[in-house]
Amino acid sequence: EEELQMIQPEKLLLVTVGKTATLHCTVTSLLPVGPVLWFRGVGPGRELIYNQKEGHFPRVTTVSDLTKRNNMDFSIRISSITPADVGTYYCVKFRKGSPENVEFKSGPGTEMALGAKPS
């Protein structure tokens, strides 16, 4: 089996207030089975941004159709950016577990920061 890697190509993403930000994440393998989640920050206080399998995230859309059985693109778009959205975003692969899924591998993270306002 090819070892799964989480690829977040941008280390830094400069965004503009009010605009939409695209955070890229691709995986190199579909295995082990389990969901991909997005978080802002690390550790126990990290904020869940998007959960592939459940939840309501009105400002978040996926770039690809995650219902494709061979989908490896878990990039997301966050609309209506505000200063409160700055931080480092991680896409994280979980493997299935009982009763809870188990964190398997994290991407290196993408820092979202505010860029200069357009003149």
Epitope: L31, P32, V33, K53, D65, T67, K96
Partner: antibody, heavy 118, light 107 residues
Framework: DVQLVESGGGVVRPGESLRLSCAAS????????MSWVRQAPGKGLEWLAG????????YYIDSVKGRFTISRDNPKNSLYLQMSSLTAEDTAVYYC???????????WGLGTLVTVSS | ALTQPASVSANPGETVKITCSGG??????YAWYQQKSPGSAPVTVI????KRPSDIPSRFSGSASGSAATLIITGVRVEDEAVYYC???????????FGAGTTLTVL
């Protein structure tokens, strides 16, 4: 309430074609992958085909590849199964099912009976 | 292929366990589907190994480990008589499969 209602079943002769429909309501149809599953008389469940939410990707069991085509019309909240070159072995109740995020099934239709007989 | 026993029986109130083997824990998610009569609509009682839909009684539970999944009915009732199908999705092949079904008889 999620509701899936199949239609289009009936009696056909070997070699003929049939198109099944599944009308979906009670959920955002365009957000879910869908599948067709059948059950021959006295037999178990058999998955036939699946389709992604957007309709661009389709998946089939080997035994129906080339004969059956799954498709969907999201504005009409409808799923279809076009079946051709039917044989007696295709006689079954055909169910449409909504997929979970990991391609299992959470809701099923009541089924429509297809009988292939000369 | 997924393998499950052809039949199990129990008295009301007992705990029933139905096993399903043949999948790979690394690549397979399991579900359990209840069919009360042939040709009637199946009902999903467990999906994603151990997730119970909100309208399914709490006496139904599921687990998976290694190459097997288990459906557990704690305090079985007469109305639980049905055929239970184990289902799997294999992320390696993109294919759904079913076991042959287990007939549960409540004595």
């Amino acid at each position: 309430d999620v509701q899936l209602v199949e239609s289009g079943g009936g009696v056909v002769r070997p070699g003929e074609s049939l198109r099944l429909s599944c009308a979906a309501s009670g959920f955002t149809f365009s957000s879910y992958a869908m599948s067709w599953v059948r059950q021959a008389p006295g037999k178990g469940l058999e998955w036939l085909a699946g389709i992604s939410a957007g309709g661009s990707d389709t998946y089939y069991i080997d035994s129906v590849k080339g004969r059956f085509t799954i498709s969907r019309d999201n504005p009409k909240n409808s799923l279809y199964l076009q079946m051709s070159s039917l044989t007696a072995e295709d006689t079954a109740v055909y169910y449409c099912a909504r997929e979970t995020w990991n391609h299992l099934f959470d809701y099923w239709g009541l089924g429509t009976l297809v009988t292939v007989s000369s | 292929a997924l393998t499950q026993p052809a039949s199990v029986s129990a008295n009301p109130g007992e705990t029933v366990k139905i096993t399903c083997s043949g999948g790979d824990y690394y690549s397979t998610y399991y579900a359990w589907y209840q069919q009360k009569s042939p040709g009637s609509a199946p009902v999903t009682v467990i999906h994603s190994d151990d997730k119970r839909p909100s309208d399914i009684p709490s006496r139904f539970s599921g687990s998976a480990s290694g190459s097997a999944a288990t459906l557990i009915i704690t305090g079985v009732r007469v109305e639980d008589e049905a055929v239970y199908y184990c289902g799997g999705y294999d992320g390696r092949t993109y294919i759904n499969t079913f076991g042959a079904g287990t007939t549960l008889t409540v004595l």
